[in-house]
Amino acid sequence: IPPHVQKSVNNDMMVTDNNGAVKFPQLCKFCDVRFSTCDNQKSCLSNCSITSICEKPQEVCVAVWRKNDENITLETVCHDPKLPYHDFILEDAASPKCIMKEKKKPGETFFMCSCSSDECNDNIIFSEEYNTSNPD
């Protein structure tokens, strides 16, 4: 770190790689929870107009799709993959694409994905063909 830039103790805003270089933060769609018309499709766009700079450079993009008897919602956020989200680990955080995986939640259908390329939670993918390891 250049000497004129203070390095704070226990500062998770200053994330460095193995060479000491500062990591840029992720750019993610960030509309929190919105009603959605995404249903029975192989993939959907988030229809979120806000692309936000994630607060911490270790954060990745997350999308959560939920369907119950009343409505469908899509949540788009940044989140630290070291921490659970909705009580689930972000196991696919290194993926460049947001491949939805179903999670068990009583009373609703619940899918979640995470990914680590810019605005990758804008395009959420449900199609089974992506759920095996896909190099794209």
């Epitope: 270089a21 840029f24 992720q26």
Partner: nanobody
Framework: EVQLLESGGGLVQPGGSLRLSCAAS???????RMWWVRQAPGKGLEWVS?????????YYADSVRGRFTISRDNSKNTLYLQMNSLRAEDTAVYYC?????????????????WGQGTLVTVSS
Amino acid sequence: EVQLLESGGGLVQPGGSLRLSCAASGSTFTEYRMWWVRQAPGKGLEWVSAIEPIGHRTYYADSVRGRFTISRDNSKNTLYLQMNSLRAEDTAVYYCAKQAPGEKWARRWDLDYWGQGTLVTVSS
């Protein structure tokens, strides 16, 4: 290679405005996504805003959205940050940074090309 020099900081009252500039030397300015980053006294880095080289699409941190506007003039190799409705919590040293192009944007900051920054103090 692009080297960066920030200017335009100063003392301003709450609610006031400032315009920061970042002059880039080097012929490759138009290849880089550019950022404004700030560091408040005793705090860590906060990523404030970014702008794409082509199309000039912009991104903001929630803390400054609607108050700050990032822009660039590729013909002048200059990056700008218009700061309105300034608050005490905007007090910081402001740096510009370049993000290298790649298949996807490189996620590491080339530390050889930090400027000295420009100090913004918001106080009555």
